[in-house]
């Protein structure tokens, strides 16, 4: 049965931010997992895509992601299907809108002492709370004949008088964030002496070193005064300009012109109109310097013919918002057809091989233009250049099996031996072109081989047999150095195998014939009685018709095997006295003697002052201590053989002499006295 280890759960999400609907499945066999949105399968895009079994959102969209999501796991073999619990997003968002006149129906109907209602068209979820501003100053409920209905987003002025004239704006904030009105409303209630806005400055975005113009006009009777201020409250006039506004000009009609705009000129400009009576009207506009960031790199994409694919171009951050378009081969893509642009996406429907190539996403605004290329490869199913062939390979030599294919992109080749994937190791190597090399062919390599060549578009495979031809070889190879015991019978075997049974013969390396007491019997060299003259170099030659001959060289040494002339005896020594363990061996070549004590070889160069090994092989230990007790092994060895003999050493406390004992009394046990 299919079991959900993790189910998707409904959750809060923020518009344009990341989100993840988790889904994890456990099943006895392979299952494939997909997602439904309101019952319809979810297609992967760069914004919303499967990540493992889970569904990942790069940027939540309140319109496209509203509805019920469900994770579905299906076993394509059994047809069993399991569906997770439903999950949906509570998407939090806020969106700016204009301030509009709700009552009366038109601006022309606004008269002093009438009721005026303005509405703030900022919307969001959860419902935001609203704040109203007149000429940039916050309005609090109940002050100066106005009421704010947050529920209806309305500002009511009852009655409206000249003192209410001004630029009305609103801002709203919620758990998601904050937004301010995209277009403000200028309320003008005539009091001839009050300054009234005729033309309000607008926010301006300009490219560096371009010019910016702010228009500002007030009317009143008598005419009002007009003054421009930059951020730090520094007045701007044609006679006194701040150092960083040297290129500012104020025209008679109130317009402010800035030429060769630099970053330091960016900021808030205030236009202040003052009538004979009434409050000053302060209008604000911001000068933004246009900017455009770099675009992120595209990963190369590999698509299969006949499919539909989309590539999303995420526009770079910029001011103003950059416009985006796609080009291919220098031509802008249309908004419909088989290969077209939809929003920021490049859409390729029913992909053809000819669609492969470089596509360019362009983004541009006042600050300039950015572009980023994406390389699209249309994958093709591999085709054969050379299939693997049934082959006879020689044992011990390298063997090659071809698997040459062509496709776009370059195909991946894997090899199987006895239906098991070959992993590259010291014996098997797969070349870039797909050829398999068996570094040193063994008889076990005689079996089935199969190669598979794949691209995302599909795969092809072919198999071939390998038959291994046995090489001519010694089984086993004779030891290159061997010893024979002087005056004894000895045999030196030599055997070989090949595709045909080889004949085997021995000869002396110098080419001389074997003496009559030495026989060569089917590859075994037999010495009836070894003499000193039998030492030397011999060659075993194995040969057959089809494979020629092979040779093995053996150096025979004649030796007198080791015997012990003197062996160490079981020895007991008083603590603090000296122990002598004697050992003498004879043989030819003359044996060397080594001692082993307490399970380690006693290195003559590292014995310390208490121990010494004599030329004749005897071991002496001075000032013995209880820890010197144990088994000591005398090892005699030469180039032909090795023998050992051992004896225990006991270290005992010296007894305290009793009154009755005379000076000549013998010790209670046999020991060395020093």
């Amino acid at each position: 049965a299919i079991v959900f280890i993790k189910q998707p759960s409904s959750q809060d999400a923020l518009q344009g931010r990341r989100a993840l609907l988790r889904c994890e499945v456990e099943a006895p066999g392979p299952v494939h997992v997909y997602w439904l949105l309101d019952g319809a399968p979810v297609q992967d895009t760069e914004r919303r895509f499967a990540q493992g079994s889970s569904l990942s959102f790069a940027a939540v969209d309140r319109l496209q992601d509203s509805g019920t999501f469900q994770c579905v796991a299906r076993d394509d073999v059994t047809g069993e299907e399991a569906r997770s619990a439903n999950a949906s997003f509570n998407i939090k968002w806020i969106e700016a809108g204009p301030v509009v006149l709700k009552h009366p129906a038109s601006e022309a109907e606004i008269q002093p002492q009438t009721q005026v209602t303005l509405r703030c068209h900022i919307d969001g979820h959860p419902r935001p709370t609203y704040q109203w501003f007149r000429d940039g100053t916050p309005l609090s409920d109940g002050q100066s004949n106005h009421t704010v209905s947050s529920k209806e987003r309305n500002l009511t002025l009852r009655p409206a008088g000249p003192e209410h004239s001004g630029l009305y704006s609103c801002c709203a904030h919620s758990a998601f964030g904050q937004a301010c009105s995209s277009q403000n409303f200028t309320l003008s209630i005539a009091d001839e002496s009050f300054a009234r806005v005729v033309l309000a400055p607008q926010d301006v975005v300009v490219a560096r070193y371009e010019e910016a113009m702010f228009h500002c006009q007030f009317s009143a009777q008598p005419p009002p005064s007009l003054q421009w201020l930059f951020e730090d409250e520094t007045p701007i006039t044609n006679r006194s300009r701040p150092p960083h506004l040297r290129r500012a000009t104020v025209f008679a009609n109130g317009s402010l012109l800035l030429t060769q705009v630099r970053p330091r000129n960016a900021g808030i400009y205030r236009c202040i109109g003052q009538g004979q009576r009434g409050p000053p009207i302060i209008l604000e506009a911001t000068l933004h310097l246009a900017e455009i960031e770099d675009m992120p790199l595209f990963e190369p994409r590999v698509f299969t013919a006949g499919s539909e694919e989309r590539v999303t171009c995420l526009p770079p951050k910029g001011l103003p918002e950059p416009s985006v378009w796609w080009e291919h081969a220098g031509v802008r893509l249309p908004t419909h057809g088989r290969v077209y642009q939809k929003g920021h996406e490049l859409v390729l429907a029913n992909i053809a091989e000819s669609d492969a190539g470089v596509y360019t996403c362009h983004a541009a605004n006042l600050a300039g233009q950015r572009r980023q290329d994406v390389n699209i490869t249309v994958a093709t199913v591999p085709s054969w250049l050379k299939k693997p062939q049934d082959s006879q390979l020689e044992e011990g030599k390298p063997g090659y099996l071809d698997c040459l294919t062509q496709a776009t992109p370059k195909p991946t080749v894997v090899w199987y031996r006895n239906q098991m994937l070959i992993s590259e190791d010291s014996r098997f190597e797969v070349f870039k072109n797909g050829t398999l090399r068996i570094n040193s062919v063994e008889v076990y390599d005689g079996t089935w081989y199969r190669c598979m060549s794949s691209t995302p578009a599909g795969s092809i495979e072919a198999q071939a047999r390998v038959q291994v031809l046995e090489k001519l070889k010694f089984t086993p190879p004779p030891q290159p150095q061997q010893c024979m015991e002087f005056d004894k019978e000895a045999t030196v075997p030599c055997s070989a195998t090949g595709r045909e049974k080889p004949t085997i013969k021995w000869e002396r390396a110098d080419g001389s014939s074997l003496p009559e007491w030495v026989t060569d019997n089917a590859g075994t060299l037999h010495f009836a009685r070894v003499t000193r003259d039998d030492a030397g170099n011999y060659t075993c030659i194995a040969s057959n018709g089809p494979q020629g001959q092979i040779r093995a060289h053996v150096q025979l040494t004649v030796a007198v095997f080791i015997t012990f002339k003197v062996e160490p005896e079981r020895t007991t020594v008083y603590q603090g006295h000296t122990a002598l363990l004697q050992c003498e061996a004879q043989g030819d070549p003359k044996p060397l003697i080594q001692w082993k004590g307490k399970d380690r070889i006693l290195d003559p160069t590292k014995l310390g002052p208490r121990m010494h090994i004599f030329q004749n092989g005897s071991l002496v230990i001075h000032d013995v201590a209880p820890e010197d007790s144990g088994r000591y092994t005398c090892i005699a060895g030469n180039s032909c053989n090795i023998k050992h003999t051992e004896a225990p050493l006991y270290v005992v406390d010296k007894p305290v002499p009793e009154e009755s004992e005379g000076p000549g009394s013998p010790p209670p046990y046999k020991m060395i006295q020093t």
């Epitope: 076990y444 005689g446 038959q467």
Partner: antibody
């Protein structure tokens, strides 16, 4: 040196299932050998039944494929033959054999299975 | 299935004789041919593999040759222990098939 030893009942009833096991010694069943079954009806020639590799891949004689199952037990170092719906014509000496390089270099001594009621 | 036909079906010879057994495949099998020797009440024993390669431990008087569809097994000088039934087998395609056998008897 690989040695093979067949075991199983010598008498099977018609329409029953013949079950034989081949114990492998002197080598591992996970080596590069293919492990085969061959049979020889009394006084007749040799007939190849099928083969298995330690990974579980099998090849069967199409004439017997619908009735044959060969399996491998790595933990016991043995492989088995099951032949269902047997008839008198399935009476034979059954050999297990193995090899590599496209030959059968190692054989068991064979076991006679008689199909009779 | 590939049919393997051996000839002769039986043959009488004396110790020291040279004998030849032939095996023909119904379609080409390259060199995927093996020869086996079977004595009464015994399991078959591999003599030759890959048409001409001598199995380890087999005397050199046994020799195999041929490729494609026609193959021969030659025993150069018969020994008493060589009297037995000989089978050829193809391992080129499944099912692997044996010849019907050649019985070599003492004259």
């Amino acid at each position: 040196q690989v040695q093979l030893q067949e075991s199983g009942p010598g008498l099977v009833k018609p329409s029953g299932t013949l079950s034989l096991t081949c114990a492998v010694s002197g080598g591992s069943i996970s080596s590069d050998h293919w492990w085969s079954w061959v049979r020889q009806p009394p006084g007749k020639g040799l007939e190849w039944i099928g083969e298995i590799f330690h990974s579980g891949n099998t090849n069967y004689n199409p004439s017997l494929k619908s009735r044959v199952t060969i399996s491998v037990d790595k933990s016991k170092n043995q492989f088995s033959l099951k032949l269902s719906s047997v008839a008198a014509a399935d009476t034979a000496v059954y050999y297990c054999a193995s090899g590599y390089n496209w030959n059968l270099g190692y054989w068991g001594q064979g076991t006679l299975v008689t199909v009779s009621s | 299935d590939i049919q393997m036909t051996q000839s002769p079906s039986s043959l009488s010879a004396s110790v020291g004789d040279r004998v030849t057994i032939t095996c023909r495949a119904s379609q080409t099998i390259s060199s995927y041919l093996n020869w086996y020797q079977q004595k009464p009440e015994k399991a078959p024993k591999l003599l030759i593999y890959a048409a001409s390669s001598l199995q380890r431990g087999v005397p050199s008087r046994f020799r195999g040759s041929g490729s494609g569809t026609d193959f021969t097994l030659t025993v150069s000088s018969l020994q008493p222990e060589d009297f037995a039934t000989y089978y050829c087998q193809q391992s080129y395609s499944i099912p692997y098939t044996f010849g019907q056998g050649t019985k070599l008897e003492i004259k």
